[in-house]
Interface confidence: low
């Protein structure tokens, strides 16, 4: 133990920090299996053959790349979040849908529209989301634009949740936006379509109030040869939850100290 | 000490505790020198008698009252930060001053604007500063309003700082937005009038813009007899910075370990 | 700050973050996990030296303050300040798994 | 969380946020801060359990080992978690100031 | 607009126990400080203590064994527990905010409840 | 415990009168002194804080004044609706707020 210690970590003390580091890693070791909530690690019998499903690496990718607008992970967390989150996605509605029909010739605007069927298949119940983020691939772009999300509220109303100024950019960029209290809501709601709305930011008194930004999946093709890739990198929403079979364990087990 | 502390970790660890304390306190004695880079208190024979000055009080009030839109300290905070900042208020420039001629008959937005010599008074030095608060006093209100914060970027044209959503309120409240990145830019120009635009939220498709917030020492005054409260409570720059004298110090005695 | 970038690159004896990569097969003896193979966990280590006496060079004593004691605490000790998650890939049974572990890797450390 | 509300209402053996009002003039001897006349400075104290043994009633050590050893630490310290700046008054010659002190009140501790 | 309501007074016997709530409206209760105060009858007021935003405690010394102050921020309530009462605990007990100026102005009682009777007899 | 002690308890003055209410402190309390008025059947009032800055809405006829262990509320034209008693209290921290045990102002 180091604590209030004024001695340097001399030669003398190179076993104390092989001990630190055996501890760490047991610690580690408890760390890794409590969070999953498991008593010793799982059997791997029935794991098939061959490589990770492509689907699935995507996801895990996905998860492990920080993106624009998303920070690290806050700390300190609350309790239920120690425990470790299953991570799926959920794709917009296919662009083909006749939802989209009436949102074509608005150009200031962009709309995403949700299944929360869908949602509701991966998060069976709204406390056990712990993070919704919508992520959408912007094309490459040469002009600087500031840029709004909004919620679907009622017919014909939308509700502001965010903006972001885009800055120029060689490459294709992932957004991400935090949702987690919108997709909180529409999991209380009944099954339906739900969606968001991102928009140009019109000021008072500007005339130009056209979106200039282009998102992979929602702007025209430009290469036939891209509509799988495209499809692939179409807006979608991350979800985080607590497995509905650990949420109950959590549930029963829980005590105050 | 006569705080309640019916917690006790057990009699026989009491002694423990209180020597706990004890370090605490000494560790404290030693952060608040060393915070304002004392050796020693400071003499107290120059001192004048009687309370303190009103304008002083109303600045520790100011810095120790959390406002709608401030966050808690920030922790982790760079070296600098370490060391205590001396807290001065800058208020805007007076409604009758010719400069507000043009902007009287526009509905969507009010207009602040602040010398920056009175600026350069408090901070003689960009680096010095390490925040900067516009605080403005929202009066009471019963409608939602979105609303949005520009600088004054060039002759015509606005720059978008931030928003927030002010929900109905009963009585008067302190709005506070970070605006430390453009304090530091007025102070790296030269001296001249800067200011700032209050707007209501325009969206692409909205007929009202109209901005419904009334702001204390901006909007019409209700009553004559408010006169000096009204104006001690217009809006105001909260200017936090390392004093010139500490600054010198700092930079003289900086190493790395 | 005490993070990676000071920290791996220096030979400080105070409350630093050192490396630490754990490799799940070899350190933990697990196949279980599919990705990543292991990570970068780091730990945080090193005395946080109480020097508060104005009888000692007057600058240093505030700068070793300064880093080692921004809490002021009885007894500041070497913990992690920033964090960062860890996702994995596992099987349950036939169904692959991604799941986000949080706060798994130490980017900083601090005296508090 | 290890906060006030918790830890003042409960007597909690472990890790926790403890009282401690600092009266500038009766603990420090200081009448040079005209304002505050004192302020809840806090402190953390308390062990780190470190509680992870599969044989042990399984939920009891989950829920203990979640609450004390967030960060798996080699050896968890309780420090402080959440801090708040505290401003005063002074006088330098005729000159009041106004300063404000970063981190000064302990608001909740965690073990890390 | 600024509104103090306490309940749970009444008529109880010695050495039984009774919690009074003071129920807050109009301000945001769990930025302030909160005290309770008690007169009895024909006489002056008392102040049997405080509670700060945090949950921090302070109580008049003849308080301390048998008076407990605690708040529920969530349900902006504020509660005194009472235990063991005697005769002489007999009065009208107050919740008042605390003012919240500079310094420790927070046991200046800006605004009071109506109060809540509270007797002592067997 | 710092103990408070006004003076006189009670007093009988007319409409129109200046009345003087003195508070003594049992050890100095800098100017954390408060002052309250005190109708039958309602709550307490806050009249006055720090010894002498006037709360809002209060008339002006109303004044305080002291530091450290004496201090005096003053009203310098008694009006109808002044009749009741008035406390003074101390705040100088947690271990000494305690109130005066209350001086009634009567008709004559």
């Known amino acids: 133990d180091y604590k209030d210690d004024d001695d340097k970590l001399s030669t003398s003390k190179t076993i104390d920090m092989e001990l630190v580091k055996r501890k760490r890693i047991e610690a580690i070791r408890g760390q890794i299996l409590s969070k999953l909530r498991l008593a010793s690690p799982p059997s791997q019998g029935e794991v098939p053959p061959g490589p990770l499903p492509e689907a699935v690496l995507a996801l895990y990718n996905s998860t492990r790349d920080r993106v624009a607008g998303e920070s690290a992970d806050p700390e300190p967390e609350p309790e239920a979040d120690y425990y470790a989150k299953e991570v799926t996605r959920v794709l917009m509605v296919d662009r083909n849908n006749a939802i989209y029909e009436k949102t074509k010739d608005i150009s200031h605007s962009i709309y995403m529209f949700f299944n929360t069927s869908d949602i509701r298949e991966a998060v069976p119940e709204p406390p056990l989301l712990s993070r919704a983020e919508l992520r959408l691939q912007r094309l490459k772009s040469s002009v600087e634009q500031h840029v709004e999300l909004y919620q679907k509220y009622s017919n014909n109303s939308w509700r502001y949740l965010g903006n972001r100024l885009l800055t120029p950019t060689d490459t294709p960029e992932w957004l991400s936006f935090d949702v987690t209290g919108v997709v909180r809501q529409w999991l209380n709601q009944g099954d339906g379509i739900q969606g968001f709305r991102f928009s140009a930011h019109c000021s008072c008194d500007s005339k130009d109030n056209k979106l200039h930004v282009e998102i992979n999946g929602i702007s025209p093709k430009r290469r036939g040869d891209l509509g799988t890739i495209h499809d692939m990198n179409r807006p979608f929403l991350l979800l985080m939850a607590t497995p509905l079979e650990r949420a109950q364990h959590l549930h029963s087990s829980r005590h105050r100290r | 000490d006569y705080k309640d502390d019916d917690d006790k970790l057990s009699t026989s660890k009491t002694i423990d505790m209180e020597l706990v304390k004890r370090k605490r306190i000494e560790a404290i004695r030693g952060q608040i020198l060393s915070k304002l880079r004392l050796a020693s208190p400071p003499s107290q024979g120059e001192v004048p008698p009687g309370p303190l000055p009103e304008a002083v009080l109303a600045l520790y009030n100011s810095t120790r009252d959390r406002v709608a839109g401030e966050s808690a300290d920030p922790e982790p905070e760079p070296e600098a930060d370490y060391y205590a900042k001396e807290v001065t208020r800058v208020l805007m420039v007076d409604r009758n001053n010719a400069i507000y001629e043009k902007t009287k008959d526009i509905s969507h937005s009010i207009y602040m604007f602040f010398n920056t010599s009175d600026i350069r008074e408090a901070v003689p030095e960009p680096p010095l500063l390490s925040r900067a608060e516009l605080r403005l006093q929202r009066l009471k209100s019963s409608v939602e309003q979105h609303v949005e914060l520009y600088q004054k970027y060039s002759n015509n044209s606005w720059r978008y700082l931030g928003n927030r959503l002010l929900t109905p309120t009963d009585t008067p409240e302190w709005l506070s937005f970070d605006v430390t990145g453009v304090v530091r830019q007025w102070l790296n120009q030269g001296d001249g009038i800067q200011g700032f635009r209050f707007s209501a939220h325009c969206s692409c498709d909205s007929k009202d813009n109209k901005l419904h917030v009334e702001i204390n020492g901006i909007s019409p005054k209700r009553r004559g007899d408010l006169g000096t409260i009204h104006d001690m409570n217009r809006p105001f720059l909260l200017l936090m910075a390392t004093p010139l004298e500490r600054a010198q110090h700092l930079h003289s005695s900086r190493h790395r370990r | 700050a005490l993070d990676t970038n000071y920290c791996f690159s220096s030979t400080e004896k105070n409350c630093c973050v050192r490396q630490l990569y754990i490799d799940f097969r070899k350190d933990l003896g697990w196949k279980w996990i599919h990705e990543p193979k292991g990570y970068h966990a780091n730990f945080c280590l090193g005395p946080c030296p109480y020097i508060w006496s104005l009888d000692t060079q007057y600058s240093k004593v505030l700068a070793l303050y300064n880093q080692h004691n921004p809490g002021a605490s009885a007894s500041p000790c070497c913990v992690p300040q920033a964090l960062e998650p860890l996702p994995i890939v596992y099987y349950v049974g036939r169904k692959p798994k991604v799941e986000q572990l949080s706060n798994m890797i130490v980017r900083s450390c601090k005296c508090s | 969380a290890l906060d006030t509300n918790y830890c003042f209402s409960s007597t909690e053996k472990n890790c926790c946020v403890r009282q401690l009002y600092i009266d500038f003039r009766k603990d420090l001897g200081w009448k040079w801060i005209h304002e505050p006349k004192g302020y809840h400075a806090n402190f953390c104290l308390g062990p780190c359990p470190y509680i992870w043994s599969l044989d042990t009633q399984y939920s009891k050590v989950l829920a203990l080992y979640n609450q004390h050893n967030p960060g798996a630490s080699a050896s968890p310290c309780c420090v402080p978690q959440a801090l708040e700046p505290l401003p005063i008054v002074y006088y330098v010659g005729r000159k009041p100031k106004v300063e404000q002190l970063s981190n000064m009140i302990v608001r909740s501790c965690k073990c890390s | 607009q600024v509104q103090l309501v306490e309940s749970g007074g009444g008529v109880v016997q010695p050495g039984r126990s009774l919690r009074l709530s003071c129920a807050a409206s109009?301000?945001?209760?769990?930025?302030?400080?909160m005290n309770w105060i008690r007169q009895p009858p024909g006489k002056g007021l008392e102040w049997i203590g405080y509670?700060?935003?945090?949950?921090?405690?302070y109580r008049a010394n003849w308080a301390r064994g048998r008076f407990t102050i605690s708040r529920d921020n969530s349900k902006n309530t504020l509660y005194l527990q009472m235990n063991s009462l005697r005769a002489e605990d007999t009065a009208v007990y107050y919740c008042?905010?605390?003012?919240?100026?500079?310094?420790?102005?927070?046991?200046?009682?800006?605004?009071w409840g109506q109060g809540t009777l509270v007797t002592v007899s067997s | 415990d710092i103990q408070m002690t006004q003076s006189p308890s009670s007093l009988s003055a007319s409409v129109g009168d200046r009345v003087t209410i003195t508070c003594q402190a049992s050890?100095?309390?800098?100017?954390?002194l408060a002052w309250y008025q005190q109708k039958p059947g309602q709550p307490p009032k806050l009249l006055i804080y720090a010894a002498s800055t006037l709360e809002w809405g209060v008339p002006s006829r109303f004044s305080g004044s002291g530091s450290g262990t004496d201090f005096t509320l003053t009203i310098s034209s008694l009006q109808p609706e002044d009749f009741a008693t008035y406390y003074c209290q101390s705040y100088s921290d947690g271990d000494s707020v305690g109130f005066g045990q209350g001086t009634k102002v009567e008709i004559k």
């Open positions: 509670i700060y935003t945090s949950g921090t405690t």
């Open positions: 008042a905010r605390g003012w919240h100026i500079f310094g420790h102005h927070y046991w200046v009682m800006h605004f």
């Open positions: 050890q100095s309390i800098s100017t954390y």
């Open positions: 109009g301000f945001h209760f769990s930025s302030e400080a």
